[in-house]
């Protein structure tokens, strides 16, 4: 191009204003409404309506004139209800009477199919602590737990660890103030993400892996029941629930002496075809580096809050950014990939299968994932969960974006980072971070209490608009948050990932570990090497910062080399010592398994609290491998091997 034809350089303030003005004229509500029309609801993964919506999104992406639009097909196994209904009954201990409590309308996917009978014990939310605090032993008994606090899968895993034989989950009125006591709800019990029958590898049609089964699948039956059914069970139970549970007055602890509860689950496995829909706006400088923006499309019930809001945000952001590029002169350096996932309700299956399909290369190309799921569940609070690499970006964005109702900046607490909650299994950002080592962020406008209708037949547009009358304003704010992330991540020459944040994460871990230095000394071990690895990581981050300061920002080759070092930071916190098939969530900070730093600390605690459960050999391994993982991250960040100080 001639110099005269050069596109004028757009700066952050120009782009921020451009984004804001475009979002001002966007009608998010009508898109959310459209996604809740009969043609697209209900849209259980793999159903015709899920596919209808996939086609619609693909079409919309094409109409947005994205650089490229494509789809990925996966064949996955899910579990659905059988025509033979699941049941909960109360029986006399000698079967002198049988009383049907409920044939529930909902179910829990990936439950074990079985019929079990026994005493029923209330275990509050089913957390590890809840089970520890119980007076009644649960081994050989069924447990009933309240929905909330932790995922269904964690509740079931905890119950199984306590040797319970089955689990019932209900929504109490105190935590979920739903008028209709008969509302049924859905969830899944896979302590993991992706297709549990292809753990750690992708389920493309042509991949012929031997039959396999995720270790995160439960071995006991689990079933959701309505509040009305729970109350019928409580009528046959005794012992008031502790007042500090803050639950309904009807709550009772254990079945009466002469009564048993029978749970019968007979769900069926079903292989389905799911579609992930993608569209990309190609970067002008580094098109092979991209930020991924994604939303779950499927839903068991109507899914207004669960999947329609996120999908609407995805569609509107695709349109907005496409306009900014095609009409307004925005030239992102890096690419933006828009992704609509299916089978999210079964444990981020679509997202995980995509990650599994490109495990060896994705972390070299995708440098951030922005999750749009459940971004609007209320108005009062702005909450975020993310990799520490994104904290600086989040803080800048919170300072720039105003609260949709109060008009004040979202940045109201300088200590916000210390209150960030870890990403959990039920968040699509989790596998990006913990499985693939790609920095990820998930955020929401929400209330102090849970949005009561998620996963229920009442997650309708009507309830959403009645609960959040300012829906359009709040959705606009959510789009602005995501949009600012997208601009900052694709526009700035220097990658907006704050690699120095992991210094404080490492320091915090060492501080916690230091409390047990006497134990470590008694085992003849030293923390010297761990301190040394942390020191090397600190020096590597300082050196990288210096390299950035000293580099010529216009030298694309140098900047790409430096940015590539930054991109690898998260990935190098994936433990190289465990198999992605056996322990898919390899991240030592955010993953799950004995390789994680939190598992190492929990294990070490046992040396004092439950010495028989402590395994010194395992601990020595944990400490050595954690040390080497951190050292490896430091080495990777340092750059070329001739720059690495090998005193280790």
């Amino acid at each position: 191009k001639d110099d005269d034809d050069k596109v004028p350089q757009l700066y952050w303030d120009d782009l921020k204003k451009m984004l804001s003005e475009k979002l001002d004229t966007t009608d998010f509500t009508s898109t959310i409404k459209l996604l809740n029309e009969n043609s697209y609801v209900p849209r259980e993964a793999g159903s015709q309506k899920d596919e209808n919506l996939a086609w619609y999104i693909e079409n919309q992406f094409r109409e947005c004139k994205l650089s490229k639009v494509w789809r990925d097909e996966h064949f996955v196994k899910i579990q659905v209800k059988d025509s033979a209904q699941n049941s909960v009954t109360i029986t006399g201990t000698n079967s002198e009477f049988v009383y049907l409590v409920e044939n529930p309308g909902g179910y829990v996917a990936y439950s074990q199919n079985a019929t079990v009978t026994g005493k029923l014990v209330h275990a509050n939310f089913g957390t590890e602590k809840d089970f520890e605090d119980l007076d009644s032993p649960v081994n050989g008994s069924l447990v009933i737990v309240r929905a909330g606090k932790i995922t269904f899968a964690e509740k079931v895993a905890n119950a199984e660890s306590a040797n319970a034989i089955g689990v019932l989950i209900y929504m109490d009125k105190t935590k979920f103030p739903i008028v209709d006591a008969d509302v049924s709800f859905f969830g899944h019990a896979h302590l993991g993400t992706g297709d549990p029958y292809t753990p750690g590898f992708p389920s493309f049609n042509h991949t012929q892996f031997p039959p396999s089964r995720s270790s995160g699948l439960p071995n006991i039956p689990v079933q959701t029941i309505s509040r009305a059914a729970a109350e019928r069970l409580f009528e046959n139970m005794e012992g008031d629930c502790p007042s500090d549970w803050k639950t309904d007055s009807s709550c009772r602890m254990v079945t009466s002496q002469n009564k048993s509860v029978k749970l019968s689950v007979s769900n069926v496995m079903k292989e389905i075809k799911i579609l992930n829909i993608f569209g990309v706006i190609k970067g002008f400088v580094e098109p092979d580096r991209y930020v991924v923006v994604g939303a779950q499309r499927d839903s068991w019930g109507p899914g207004a809050a669960k999947s329609s809001v996120g999908t609407a945000l995805l569609l509107e952001l695709a349109q907005t950014f496409s306009d900014m590029v095609l009409k307004d002169g925005f030239q992102p350096s890096r690419s933006i990939v828009f992704a609509s996932w299916s089978a999210g309700d079964f444990g981020s299956v679509g997202a995980t299968e995509w990650l599994e399909g490109y495990l060896s290369s994705l972390h070299l190309k995708a440098f951030t994932f922005i999750n749009l799921d459940k971004a609007v569940l209320g108005t009062s609070n702005f909450r975020v969960s993310a990799s520490p690499l994104l904290y600086a970006l989040i803080e800048k964005t919170m300072q720039e974006v105003k609260h949709p109702v109060t008009g004040l900046s979202l940045y109201q607490d300088s200590n916000w980072a210390s209150k960030v909650e870890k990403l959990t299994f039920d968040n699509a950002a989790f596998p990006f971070l913990a499985y693939s080592g790609i920095p990820a962020v998930s955020f929401c406008f929400c209330e102090d209490t849970d949005y009561p209708y998620l996963g229920t037949t009442m997650d309708t547009y009507k309830e959403l608009i009645e609960k959040i009358p300012q829906l359009n304003k709040v959705a606009r704010a959510a789009a602005e948050v995501a949009g600012q992330f997208m601009i900052k991540l694709t526009h700035d020459v220097e990658l907006n990932l704050d690699y120095e944040r992991y210094n404080s994460q490492l320091l915090s871990f060492l501080r916690n570990l230091n409390q047990y230095r006497a134990d470590i000394r008694e085992m003849g071990l030293s923390l010297q090497w761990l301190y040394s690895a942390r020191g090397d990581f600190f020096r590597a981050t300082s050196r990288l910062t210096t390299d950035f300061k000293n580099s010529e920002k216009t030298d694309r080759f140098v900047m790409k080399e430096l940015n590539d070092r930054v991109m690898k930071v998260e990935y190098y916190f994936l433990s190289p010592y465990v198999s992605p098939r056996e322990s898919p969530f390899r991240h030592i900070f955010w993953g799950s398994g004995s390789h994680t730093l939190s598992a190492l600390l929990e294990h070490l605690k046992l040396r004092k609290t439950n010495n028989r459960a402590f395994n010194e050999t395992l601990f020595r391994n944990q400490l050595a491998l954690a040390t080497w993982t951190i050292q490896g991250a430091a080495n990777a960040l340092s750059g070329d091997i001739w720059d690495i100080d090998n005193e280790f």
């Epitope: 409404k33 029309e37 609801v41 006591a181 207004a304 009507k462």
Partner: antibody, heavy 121, light 106 residues
Framework: QVQLQQWGAGLLKPSETLSLTCAVY????????WTWIRQPPGKGLEWIGE???????NYNPSLKSRVTISVDTSKNQFSLKLSSVTAADTAVYFC???????????????WGQGTLVTVSS | SYEVTQPPSVSVSPGQTASITCSGH??????ACWYQQKPGQSPVLVIY???KRPSGIPERFSGSNSGNTATLTISGTQAMDEADYYC?????????FGGGTKLTVL
């Protein structure tokens, strides 16, 4: 094809209780909103209230203190009682089935034939 | 409380397009439906979910809803379309009807 057939007293004195019944033929009773709507002569439609399949009821706030809607599922029937009627309650009373759509909103897809109730001393 | 407003009457010549409006605060955020009522008869649902037609309703009936206004449009109006038309929506667990519009086919 679903049909709604309604009956009840057509002439009442002030302070009496209006009582109407609606029978549902040819369709399931569960999963719908069984509703009463009225229309004063020459005027528009006014929603009175509904019985929801789960067992709860919803009433128009302006009539709430006087209205009771009940259901006899064994007979596929639902009833309206409006106490302490006055001349202002003179209207054609319709029973209707509310069908919820995917959005959680609902519309009335089947209606009874209507019963004219006159309140006069 | 929430109110929706309709014009009391609309006139149209046969074959022309008739538009009946229904206005309410942010009505476009809700779903609206429309009923046709002929003298001495029960109302009949003609549009639900803003723009969907129940089976048996002619294609000339269409609906839209955005901003503060829902609109029922009858294209190629016929004499048999002369009737009262009511819009309906929801607000806070209460069914809300518009006051009705008398459509006259001249």
């Amino acid at each position: 094809q679903v049909q709604l057939q309604q009956w009840g007293a057509g002439l009442l004195k002030p302070s009496e209780t209006l009582s109407l019944t609606c029978a549902v033929y040819g369709g399931s009773f569960s999963g719908y909103y069984w509703t009463w709507i009225r229309q004063p002569p020459g005027k528009g439609l006014e929603w009175i209230g509904e019985f929801i399949h789960s067992g709860s009821t919803n009433y128009n706030p302006s009539l709430k203190s006087r209205v009771t809607i009940s259901v006899d599922t064994s007979k596929n029937q639902f009833s309206l009682k409006l106490s302490s009627v006055t001349a202002a309650d003179t209207a054609v009373y319709f029973c209707a089935r509310g069908s919820m759509d995917s959005s959680g909103f609902y519309s009335f897809d089947f209606w009874g034939q209507g019963t004219l109730v006159t309140v006069s001393s | 409380s929430y109110e929706v407003t309709q014009p009391p009457s609309v006139s149209v010549s046969p074959g022309q397009t008739a538009s009946i409006t229904c206005s309410g605060h942010k009505l476009g955020d809700k779903f609206a439906c429309w009923y046709q009522q002929k003298p001495g008869q029960s109302p009949v649902l003609v549009i639900y979910q803003d723009r969907k037609r129940p089976s048996g309703i002619p294609e000339r009936f269409s609906g839209s809803n955005s901003g503060n206004t829902a609109t029922l449009t009858i294209s190629g109006t016929q004499a048999m379309d002369e009737a009262d038309y009511y819009c309906q929506t929801w607000y806070s667990s209460t069914v809300i009807f518009g006051g009705g519009t008398k459509l006259t086919v001249l």
